[in-house]
Interface confidence: low
């Protein structure tokens, strides 16, 4: 009982974590402008992974996509990248999971096979979670850096010019709800793992075979011979995201008519 | 609101140059993409020239090509027109206007007399 | 260049009666991000003009909603249900498609 409440709990919070990521990878508000120092503003810009947009403070807004993949920076590339991935492997774990519920028979399948796909699955959620944190980490870094570099601007100037009202960017929601959504799938994936171990059939028990051997009678008995669930092998570690060294040409600089392509 | 504050009225002779600008409140021009336009009297509205966001650049039309100079001063949030070799069919009410990054006359100055005569 | 053709080039009307005004472009105003950048301005006598309707049939704000726009393609109306005093002036439409950006001859409306 307490493994298929596990079983299900974990399949019910991995589906909310990757519908969340799914929401996230769609939402425009990846990063906001900063109203820190300009609360009172005529406009409001905020940008997602596909599409940037400003906000009139009549409420008049307006939504641009992103043209080319060529001419966007790597790393937001490489955020697209990540979230898709956490995607695409959230959605495969959610179909094999739906076929390793306890709770619904398919066929004479056996307790191993749903074991074997519960893992399979909770794999899944867990690298899918991964995905979601690495994607939205590294966006979140990417503001950090160019928050930082446009403040120091704002003081030291461009080429001699002094820029008064430089638009910096924040935090948008979508962050947030990236960040929830993939822990919410890895934990959904973990308690899917736990569960497996519950689903496989501890014991395996044989019937009474008589081997004649030349001149010797040796009866083996039924034992208490484990099940060996051959999970051990299946533990890889693949590496997701290399969040190496960028030179500063590649840190995504948004504040600027110049960045639409 | 955004607001664009243009120079005022202008006079000038057959040959000479004129600079008109246009100073934006309320928001930053660098995140803006600025056009000019100019309407003769009694005539309708023709596009000079602007920043195309996507190609990252200013884009003249053919008939102002190498007589018109579009710039921008970021550190007052000022745009200029620069219009030379003035002819009197040159005289007409020039105009800025921006789009919020996007393709549409969202904002427009109140309008530069420029009169062209001898 | 896109060519934008508008009739008619005047529209007496009588007031709170509805005016239609036409536009026609040279070719598709279909951008290829899907959009159809087509705007309607209108410049009141001694103004500049001023946004009233952008991508065919968006009303931008402060608008009244006696205002609206249609069409697809290359062909696009600018409706006013009741025509209001204020409603005098010289109606263009634009094209922000492609660059050069164009614009009508503009359509006069006046109140007979």
């Known amino acids: 009982m307490a493994v298929t409440a596990c079983q299900g709990l974990g399949f019910v919070v991995s589906l909310i974590g990757i519908a969340g990521i799914i929401a996230a990878t769609c939402m425009d508000q990846w990063s906001t402008q900063d109203l820190y120092n300009n609360p009172v503003t005529a406009v409001f810009n905020y940008q997602g992974l596909w599409r940037s947009c400003v906000r009139e403070s009549s409420g008049f807004t307006e939504c641009r996509g992103y043209f080319t993949l060529l001419g966007l920076p790597a790393m937001l590339q490489a955020v697209r990248a990540l979230m898709i991935v956490g995607i695409v492997l959230g959605a495969i774990g959610l179909l094999v999971s739906i076929f390793a519920l306890k709770c619904i028979r398919i066929g004479s399948m056996e307790d191993s096979a749903k074991a074997n796909m519960t893992l399979t699955s909770g794999i899944m959620f867990i690298v899918s979670g991964l995905c979601a944190i690495a994607g939205v980490s590294v966006f979140a870094n990417m503001l950090v850096t160019n928050f930082w570099m446009s403040t120091a601007n704002m003081y030291t100037g461009m080429g001699g010019m002094v820029q008064t009202v430089q638009t910096r960017y924040t935090f948008g929601a979508a962050l947030f709800v990236g960040w929830v959504a993939g822990g919410l799938t890895l934990i959904g994936g973990v308690m899917m793992c736990i569960a497996c171990r519950g689903l496989a059939p501890e014991e395996t028990n044989y019937k009474a075979v008589s081997y004649h051997a030349s001149g010797h009678s040796v009866a083996y008995k039924p034992g208490g011979f484990k099940a060996s669930t051959g999970f051990g092998s299946n533990t890889k570690n693949k590496k997701i995201y290399d969040g190496g060294a960028r030179t500063e040409d590649e840190v995504q600089s948004y504040p600027s008519k110049h960045d639409y392509v | 609101q955004v607001q664009l504050v243009q120079s005022g009225a202008e006079v000038k002779k057959p040959g000479a140059s004129v600079k008109v600008s246009c100073r934006v409140s309320?928001?930053?021009?660098?995140?803006?993409?600025m056009y000019w336009v100019r309407q003769a009297p009694g005539k309708g509205l023709e596009w000079m020239g602007g920043f195309d966001p996507e190609d990252g650049k200013t884009i003249y039309a053919q008939k102002f090509q190498g007589r018109v100079t579009m710039t921008e001063d970021t550190s007052t949030g000022t745009a200029y027109m620069e219009l030379s070799s003035l002819r009197s069919e040159d005289t007409a009410i020039y105009y800025c206007?921006?789009?919020?990054?996007?393709?549409?006359?969202?904002?427009w100055g109140q309008g530069t007399p420029v009169t062209v005569s001898s | 260049d896109i060519v934008m053709t508008q009739t008619p080039l005047s529209s007496p009307v009588t007031l709170g009666q509805p005016a239609s005004i036409s536009c026609r472009s040279s070719?598709?105003?279909?951008?290829?991000?899907?959009?159809?950048?087509l705007s309607w301005l209108q410049q009141r006598p001694g103004q500049p003009p001023r946004l009233l309707i952008y991508?065919?049939?968006k009303r931008f704000s402060g608008v009244p909603d006696r205002f609206s726009g249609s069409g697809a393609g290359t062909d696009f109306t600018l409706k006013i249900s009741r025509v209001e005093a204020e409603d005098v002036g010289v109606y263009y439409c634009t094209q922000g498609t492609q660059f050069p950006r164009t614009f009508g001859q503009g359509t006069k409306v006046e109140i007979k």
């Open positions: 070719q598709s105003l279909v951008h290829s991000d899907g959009n159809t950048y």
């Open positions: 206007a921006t789009t919020l990054r996007y393709f549409d006359w969202n904002y």
């Open positions: 991508k065919v049939s």
């Open positions: 309320g928001y930053t021009l660098s995140a803006l993409s």
